[in-house]
């Protein structure tokens, strides 16, 4: 091809590609009609006054993965098409001024992976016309006001991953068109007031994995358009009882990994289209009645790994969609026969790892349609008569780790699981925990006679006598509600070249990955 | 339908302590958390705490902990109330109640008046 | 604790009056705000919960509303068997809380 490089290939849709360590300054000469150039993973440590002025007619500018430390100001001189630029992954400490006059066409700047420590309002003056900033996996420890302001077009900006201790309450006030905001991974230890008050379009808020401790009573009440907010890992306390009252839009909501002792009733909403609410490893220990009831979409919510020791009986009102219900490695002893009335179309229920000594007969009663019940780990002894009879499409319950006590009432749920070993997976089995002759054997086979020997087994109505198997052949378990594969918590939905380093195990919540969206 | 019966009124020295019992009837005694609340004459109501009967849990309120002790015998599917060194100022008509859907309280029985004189 | 204000704490009303009785609570609660009538020797009885739910068999004259701190009970049209005490309750946090009351009296 003519023109190129020997150490780039160039393609006849005038893309250019310059990759290798040998290749330690920018190759000469460059296709003139070249629209996309790409220098990626060499040896480049500076770029010198005007590398690029012969090929003005670039579109895409990707210098990434280089040694890069130095970039003269002059180095993007004549690059007046240029609507995409990427310096990631560099080792640039220093940006100078003026580096980005004369790219009046440039609307994607990415910055992100470097070692900058600061950036000033004069760096982006120049960018009208941007509309992504990717600053993350920098060293930036502060952003002056100002350092925005032109930037008036920007939708996205990306600050995560950086070493900001706190924020100016100004530094987004004229970004009006901002729809994704990440400030993940910083060090914020608070939000002043009004911070983002400006971000009328703002529909990504991500804060995660800062040291937030309080929140102000009305900081997003400016960002009605609002779709998801990632608050995890903070160390958020309490939540203002209007902070999240202004969210008509809001569909992901993540509280996970917080300090929350109490949810106080109202705190939720309204938020007509929320689908999920992460809750899991806080400090809550009762849910009051109404907590969720502005939540009327919700699908997943996910509570385990707290301190419940106490559901009011309507906690859960208004929850008429909830698909999944993640109680697990709590410390329930108790659950009021109504408390789960309401989930109509509840699906999966994980209650394992928690102090439940009994279960109220009707307590699945308006569950119909519940496929998944994770009752391993807890104190039950035996369990009333006919409490599964009406769920047809239960095709997996959790029942091992019970102190089952097998005597002649155990019965009717021995035979029960006799007919319906399908359900009960083949990983463990529920085993008799007493009497003492019949420890460690297995609950579906034990002979009830023998246990009791004393006691005369009366004739006890069964429960349904109509085994039930599911339609496929097996269920693997690598698929089933307490799958302990390691996934992600959220997804926190980025496009970007980030990826949100999670370590969270799928034990967490006790669910599927198809469930974990 | 659901019903609480109470038993009935007592008179009571100052120290003493009395034991009113609830008997529950209608529905599943051990699945339902049974409250007790309290009226001193003239006055407002006043929650006591809660039992749940299928285990024996409960919670009191800070004001009557350490005088108060809630049980239950699911054999006869009775909750009783004991309250210690009463006072006059316990005088007072002693209810249990029953939540419904919510922790409001549905069903009521019918109260057992407690006289604290000397 | 949360205290529950109630107010007034007696009212004299004639039948056919529309009545209002307002509770306020010392932080929010939410909706979880419940009404009880109580006639002399009986227990409560309950009206409306969630702070505007009419409880089973209960009039349609008795209507509730609010959120947050402020709550009202009211009777459109005040019926003879109407007169008696009012107490508001809320269940949000522990200890459960009552108002006062209000004793609605024949003008």
């Known amino acids: 091809y003519h023109g190129c490089p020997s150490e780039c290939t160039c393609s006849r849709a005038s893309q250019v590609e310059c990759t290798g360590a040998r290749i330690v300054a920018v190759p000469t000469p460059l296709p003139w009609n070249a629209m996309s150039l790409q220098i990626l993973n060499t040896h480049i440590t500076e770029l010198n006054e005007s590398p690029f002025l012969n090929i003005s007619a670039l579109i895409a500018l990707r210098i990434e993965k280089n040694e890069l430390s130095r970039i003269t100001p002059g180095a993007f001189r004549n690059l007046g098409s240029l609507r995409y630029l990427s310096l990631a992954n560099n080792k640039l400490q220093v940006l100078p001024i003026g580096l980005f006059q004369g790219l009046d066409s440039l609307e994607s700047l990415l910055l992100s992976s470097n070692q900058l420590l600061q950036i000033q309002p004069a760096h982006f003056s120049q960018c009208s016309n941007l509309k992504e900033l990717q600053l993350h996996g920098n060293h930036l420890e502060y952003i002056p006001d100002g350092a925005f302001d032109h930037l008036v077009g920007l939708t996205k900006l990306n600050l995560g991953k950086n070493s900001l201790t706190h924020i100016s309450p100004r530094v987004f006030q004229h970004l009006g068109n901002l729809q994704v905001l990440r400030l993940y991974e910083n060090r914020l230890t608070d939000i002043p007031m009004g911070t983002f008050d400006g971000l009328v379009n703002l529909q990504e808020l991500a804060l995660q994995q800062n040291q937030i401790g309080l929140l102000s009573p009305g900081l997003f009440h400016n960002n009605h358009n609002l779709q998801r907010l990632y608050l995890s890992n903070n160390h958020i306390s309490q939540l203002p009882p209007s902070v999240f009252m202004q969210l008509p839009q809001l569909n992901r909501l993540t509280l996970f990994g917080n300090s929350l002792k109490e949810l106080s009733p109202g705190i939720f909403g309204p938020m007509p289209n929320l689908r999920e609410l992460w809750l899991y490893d806080n400090h809550i220990s009762s849910l009051p009645d109404n907590v969720f009831s502005n939540l009327r979409q919700l699908q997943v919510l996910i509570l385990s790994r707290n301190q419940i020791s106490f559901i009011s009986p309507g906690a859960f009102n208004g929850l008429t969609e909830l698909r999944e219900l993640s109680l697990h490695t709590n410390a329930l002893q108790d659950l009021d026969g109504n408390v789960f009335r309401m989930l109509a179309n509840l699906q999966n229920i994980s209650l394992q790892n928690n102090r439940l000594r009994q279960l109220p007969g009707n307590i699945f009663a308006n569950v119909n349609g519940l496929m998944a019940i994770q009752l391993q780990n807890n104190q039950l002894e035996n369990l009333p008569l006919g409490i599964f009879d009406h769920l047809g499409k239960l095709c997996e319950l959790r029942l091992y780790d019970n102190p089952w006590r097998c005597d002649s009432d155990i019965l009717p749920l021995r035979n029960w699981l006799l007919l319906n070993q399908p359900r009960l997976g083949t990983d463990t089995v529920p085993v008799c925990f007493s009497p003492a002759n019949v420890r460690g054997q297995s609950l579906i086979i034990i002979n009830v006679n023998v246990a009791v020997p004393s006691v005369h087994v009366p004739e006890v109505p069964s429960y349904p006598e109509t085994p039930w198997y599911p339609d496929t052949p097996s269920y693997p378990d690598t698929t089933s509600v307490s799958s302990t594969t390691e996934l992600t918590s959220p997804v926190e939905d980025y496009t970007d070249l980030t990826t949100i380093q999670v370590t969270d195990d799928r034990s967490v919540w006790g669910m599927t990955q198809a469930q974990s969206g | 339908q659901v019903q609480l019966v109470q038993s009935g009124a007592e008179v009571k020295k100052p120290g003493a302590s009395v034991k009113v019992s609830c008997k529950a009837s209608g529905y599943t005694f051990t699945d339902y958390y049974i409250n007790w609340v309290r009226q001193a004459p003239g006055q407002g109501l006043e929650w006591m705490g809660w039992?749940?009967?299928?285990?024996?849990?409960?919670k009191y309120a800070q004001k009557f902990q350490g005088r108060v002790t809630m049980t239950r015998d699911t054999s006869t599917s009775t909750v009783y109330m004991e309250l210690s060194s009463l006072r006059s100022e316990d005088t007072a008509v002693y209810y249990c109640?029953?939540?419904?859907?919510?922790?409001?309280?549905?069903?009521w029985g019918q109260g057992t008046l407690v006289t604290v004189s000397s | 604790d949360i205290q529950m204000t109630q107010s007034p704490s007696s009212l004299s009303a004639s039948v056919g009056d529309r009545v209002t009785i307002t509770c306020k609570a010392s932080?929010?609660?939410?909706?979880?705000v419940a009404w009880y009538q109580q006639k002399p020797g009986k227990a409560p009885k309950l009206l409306i919960y969630s702070a505007s739910y009419r409880s089973s068999g209960v009039p349609s004259r008795f209507s509730g509303s609010g959120s947050g701190t402020d709550f009202t009970l009211t009777i459109s049209s005040l019926q003879p068997e109407d007169f008696a005490t009012y107490y508001c309750?809320?269940?949000?946090?522990?200890?459960?809380?009552f108002g006062g009351g209000t004793k609605v009296e024949i003008k």
């Open positions: 932080q929010n609660v939410g909706i979880n």
């Open positions: 039992i749940y009967p299928g285990s024996g849990n409960t």
């Open positions: 109640a029953r939540w419904g859907y919510g922790a409001y309280f549905t069903y």
């Open positions: 309750q809320q269940y949000s946090s522990f200890p459960y809380t």
